[in-house]
C-alpha cells in the first residue's frame, strides 16, 4: 500500500555539520510499529544512511554508532544527521514503513537536498 511522505526540498547543514529536517507521513491510522529509513542518493547511487524502528508513542532508537538521531510526534519524525562534510552533500530520502498492524504500508519522500559546506580553517594568528 502506498503512503504519501512529505519532507523539505532543501536544508543547509550547520557549520558543525549537522542537518535537521521533518519527515511527515500521511498515515491511514495509528500504526503501532513504524520503521524510518534515511537513504542518500548521489551520482545515481542510493545508500542507506540510517534506520530505526519505533513503537508508536516511544522514541526512535538508532544504533549507537549511527549518525542519525530523531524524535517522533504523531505522524511526524524529526530527523537529525550529524558529522556531515562537504562530500556528504546529496539528496536524503525519507522512507517510512508501517510494519504493524497489517497491512504493510510504504511511503517514500521526494528527498531533501542537504548542502554541506566545510568550514574555512581559521587563519594562524600572530597574537
Amino acid at each position: 500500500k502506498a503512503m504519501h511522505v512529505a519532507q523539505p526540498a532543501v536544508v543547509l547543514a550547520s557549520s558543525r555539520g549537522i542537518a535537521s529536517f521533518v519527515c511527515e507521513y500521511a498515515s491511514p491510522g495509528k500504526a503501532t510499529e513504524v520503521r524510518v529509513t534515511v537513504l542518500r542518493q548521489a551520482d545515481s547511487q542510493v545508500t542507506e544512511v540510517c534506520a530505526a524502528t519505533y513503537m508508536m508513542g516511544n522514541e526512535l532508537t538508532f544504533l549507537d554508532d549511527s549518525i542519525c538521531t530523531g524524535t517522533s510526534s504523531g505522524n511526524q519524525v524529526n530527523l537529525t544527521i550529524q558529522g556531515l562534510r562537504a562530500m556528504d552533500t546529496g539528496l536524503y530520502i525519507c522512507k517510512v514503513e508501517l510494519m504493524y498492524p497489517p497491512p504493510y504500508y510504504l511511503g517514500i519522500g521526494n528527498g531533501t537536498q542537504i548542502y554541506v559546506i566545510d568550514p574555512e580553517p581559521c587563519p594562524d594568528s600572530d597574537f
Partner: antibody
Framework: DVQLQESGQGLVKPSQSLSLTCSVT?????????WNWIRQFPGNKLEWLGY???????YYNPSLKNRISITRDTSKNQFFLKLNSVTSEDTATYFC???????????WGQGTTLTVSS | DIVMTQSQKFMSTSVGDSVSVTCKAS??????VAWYQQKPGQSPKPLIY???YRYSGVPDRFTGSGSGTDFTLTISNVQSEDLAEYFC?????????FGAGTKLELK
C-alpha cells in the same frame, strides 16, 4: 476494488436481538485492517459501534455496554453484528466499513435500514 | 469520549463560491481527523484524512487544515455536486467519534 455489502433484518421487535451480516469482496478480512459497524440515526448522527480485527480481536463502543457482539466467518469472508435487547433508540441505518487500526474509514457498505417497532 | 462539534448545521453557498466547514474537538486529537461527504441515500465517502491529505480521486478544490482541536474543510469553487452533508471524524482515540454534520445548501 474492495466492496462491502450489508444484509439482515429490516424490522425487529423491542427487546429482541438484531443480526446483520457484512459480506466483503476484493480483500480477505484476515489479511489486515479492522472491520467495523457504524450506525446513522434519523437526523444523520453517526455512531461507531465496534470492530473485529484481521486477527479476530474486538473492541466495542462502551456506550453499548454488554449488548453488542461482532463475530466473523473467515471461510465466507463475512463479519456480523449482533445487538441484544433493542429499543426504538436502535432504529438507524447500519453501515459496515473498513479502517486501518485507529484510522479513518476508507470503504463503506451502502447501509441497511433497521427499524425497531412492535 | 471525544466530542467533535460542528457548530453550523447548515451552510448556504453559491456555485463558484468558497466555503469553510469547521469542526472543534473537545481535546487534542493531533492530526488524526478525517472528513466525509454524504449525499442522500448514500454512504459517507472519504474526502480528507490525516487533517490535510486528499483521499484518492478527490478534486483539489477540497482542502483540509488544522491541528490539535480546530479543523477546517474548505471547498473552493463550489460545484453543484458538492451540495451534500459533511462530517468530521476523529480517529485519535477509541471510541472513534464523528461530528453532527454540516449540510451545504444553495443560497
Amino acid at each position: 476494488d474492495v466492496q462491502l455489502q450489508e444484509s439482515g433484518q429490516g424490522l425487529v421487535k423491542p427487546s429482541q436481538s438484531l443480526s446483520l451480516t457484512c459480506s466483503v469482496t476484493g480483500y480477505s478480512i484476515t489479511s489486515g485492517y479492522y472491520w467495523n459497524w457504524i450506525r446513522q440515526f434519523p437526523g444523520n448522527k453517526l455512531e461507531w459501534l465496534g470492530y473485529i480485527g484481521y486477527d479476530g480481536s474486538n473492541y466495542y463502543n462502551p456506550s453499548l455496554k454488554n449488548r453488542i457482539s461482532i463475530t466473523r466467518d473467515t471461510s465466507k469472508n463475512q463479519f456480523f453484528l449482533k445487538l441484544n435487547s433493542v429499543t426504538s433508540e436502535d432504529t438507524a441505518t447500519y453501515f459496515c466499513a473498513r479502517n486501518y487500526y485507529s484510522g479513518y474509514f476508507d470503504f463503506w457498505g451502502q447501509g441497511t435500514t433497521l427499524t425497531v417497532s412492535s | 469520549d471525544i466530542v467533535m462539534t460542528q457548530s453550523q448545521k447548515f451552510m448556504s453557498t453559491s456555485v463558484g463560491d468558497s466555503v469553510s466547514v469547521t469542526c472543534k474537538a473537545s481535546q487534542n486529537v493531533g492530526t488524526y481527523v478525517a472528513w466525509y461527504q454524504q449525499k442522500p441515500g448514500q454512504s459517507p465517502k472519504p474526502l480528507i484524512y490525516s487533517t490535510s491529505y486528499r483521499y484518492s480521486g478527490v478534486p483539489d478544490r477540497f482542502t483540509g487544515s488544522g491541528s490539535g482541536t480546530d479543523f477546517t474543510l474548505t471547498i473552493s469553487n463550489v460545484q453543484s455536486e458538492d451540495l451534500a452533508e459533511y462530517f468530521c471524524h476523529q480517529y485519535d482515540t477509541y471510541p472513534l467519534t464523528f461530528g453532527a454534520g454540516t449540510k451545504l445548501e444553495l443560497k
